[in-house]
């Protein structure tokens, strides 16, 4: 029996009842000419079941018997081959089971193409199995609402199949979508059944509908695009991160700094260091060293990993993040315990605002990568 379900998304209006989609290709039932074939359509709560073959309504005749959820074909002929569907219409939605019937003398084992994901791609369908359009990969279509920041690229997909190969056209808010409707136009890749708009702007907001059709039928699917205008702001750091940590000598520890920033952020991990036995320079400013920063040669800059720590690694670690609008900083303390002492629950240490206000970075060429002297702004 079929082990998949599909509801054709034939509505242009987003307020229509919910739909479900087929994930895999329709199951194929093979019969030799003259044989009888019986297929059971298992749909729950089916008030009314209707049947189609290649998108055309199927009624009973002298060889086709429709009883409840059963379809019987007596004395099958090659002309019975095609895409069959049974649809259960309910008050809240409709659901359809699809399956292929192939009546042939030559029962072979399919294609030996070295393909990976090709069912999603366009594949030309030769032969006489005329088929109404159907969705081939609904996982690509599940996300209907796309909220995209301005200036980003958006891609809508409607992977489909059918024979003859269906055509695809796009509507915006129910009307034909033309290249001149947006600055820079848009890209359509029929090969991959998709529409791409680059550098989206607020006027691109709306409903986008793909209509996939051939002479045997038409299906469509609607996406809603919301363009979120960027409001420039300095980086935001997740509260409580980095978190205070403790470990034993020789242990490993990780500090994490979670950054939210529309503009490209620059992340630095900074530590107080000593020079000539002193933590502060003659001007009273602390010596600070940049341990890690974001950039091409730095993996995941939001994480600072310390391995095989020594007592000298104990102290305050600052996560400083800046973008072109401003900066934000948060810090955590590392406690390094002697080997025999197991780490207990870390006590929260809160730096006093007075201290933070006075904290400045100083530059000292005697230390590699020591941060430029400048005032840190601290934000709650």
């Amino acid at each position: 029996r079929p082990s998949f379900s599909l509801v054709e998304d034939t509505t242009l209006e987003p307020e229509e009842p919910p739909t479900k989609y087929q994930i895999s290709q329709p199951e194929v039932y093979v019969a030799a000419p003259g044989e009888s074939l019986e297929v059971r359509c298992l749909l729950k709560d089916a008030a009314v079941i209707s049947w189609t073959k290649d998108g055309v309504h199927l009624g009973p005749n002298n060889r086709t018997v429709l009883i409840g959820e059963y379809l019987q074909i007596k004395g099958a002929t090659p002309r019975d081959s095609g895409l069959y569907a049974c649809t259960a219409t309910r008050t809240v939605d409709s659901e359809t089971w699809y399956f292929m019937v192939n009546v042939t003398d030559a029962i072979s084992s399919g294609d030996d193409e070295d393909d990976t994901d090709g069912a999603e791609d366009f594949v030309s369908e030769n032969g006489n199995n005329k088929r109404a359009p159907y969705w081939t990969n609904t996982e690509k279509m599940e996300k209907r609402l796309h909220a995209v920041p301005a200036a980003n690229t958006v891609k809508f997909r409607c992977p489909a199949g059918g024979n003859p190969t269906p055509t695809m056209r796009w509507l915006k808010n129910g009307k034909e979508f033309k290249q001149e409707h947006r600055i820079g136009g848009y890209k359509v890749r029929n090969q991959h059944w998709s529409l791409i708009m680059e550098s989206v702007v607020p006027s691109d907001k709306g409903n986008y509908t793909c209509v996939v059709e051939n002479e045997y039928g038409s299906i469509n699917h609607t996406y809603h695009l919301d363009v979120v205008e960027r409001s420039p702001h300095r980086p935001i750091l997740q509260a409580g991160l980095p978190a205070n940590a403790s470990t034993v000598v020789g242990g490993d520890v990780e500090f994490v700094c979670k950054v939210y920033s529309d503009a490209q952020p620059h992340i630095q991990w900074i530590k107080h260091v000593e020079k000539n036995g002193s933590k502060y320079g003659p001007d009273g400013l602390p010596y600070l060293k940049v341990l890690k920063h974001s950039g091409i040669n730095s993996s995941n800059a939001e994480v600072l990993a310390l391995f095989n720590v020594t007592e000298a690694d104990a102290g305050e670690y600052i996560c400083k993040v800046s973008n072109y609008i401003g900066q934000a900083n948060q810090s955590a303390w590392l406690t390094v315990l002697p080997k025999q002492q197991a780490p207990g629950r870390e006590k929260e240490i809160t730096a006093s605002p007075d201290y933070l206000e006075k904290l400045e970075f100083r530059h000292d060429s005697g230390l590699n990568d020591i941060f430029e002297a400048q005032k840190i702004e601290w934000h709650e």
């Epitope: 070295d114 990976t116 994901d117 999603e120 791609d121 690229t153 891609k155 890749r189 090969q191 991959h192």
Partner: antibody, heavy 117, light 107 residues
Amino acid sequence: QVQLVQSGAEVKKPGSSVKVSCKASGGTFSSYAISWVRQAPGQGLEWMGYISPYMGETHYAQKFQGRVTITADESTSTAYMELSSLRSEDTAVYYCARESYEYFDIWGQGTLVTVSS
Amino acid sequence: DIQMTQSPSSLSASVGDRVTITCRASQSISNDLAWYQQKPGKAPKLLIYATSILQSGVPSRFSGSGSGTDFTLTISSLQPEDFATYYCLQYYDYSYTFGQGTKVEIK
């Protein structure tokens, strides 16, 4: 087993054009798009453009727009990439690659194009 | 175009090490990301597509994860044949872009 076999190495003068071929065997040529990707010596990979033979679609990277032409001959299952107005920085290995649902799953062996006066 | 920032640009590791390479997109690319391995003088070889799906014939020590803008390729236990350059590819936008590559060298 699908294979993409490319034409041999070329040495070209600045200002001239080069046309590299990519012949597919062992699969359905028209069912897939073919992209061209190049790699300058010691550098990374750079996508140039693609052709979808059956759909008749081509799209080129902005950097190569107006200088590159990608064509296909379905009767011989061959794709072509022609790059004009060659300069020394076009010296690179040029690859054709088959798209299986957008990513590239099968690559040609590469064709070295040297641009030198 | 969508920019792909790959890091680190190179790393030294020993056989048996766990290796992680990251790729960050300049905007969300859903899960439209593939990873390739390239050895000197050879064409790139597809390892992973759709962020985490292992290409047929690729050893299971390779794995991919992530979504949106941040992606990771992990080699759980580095083998001698894994020393190569690795590239990420975004195919969300049809102006495809690769990361600049990560060279994995023997320590």
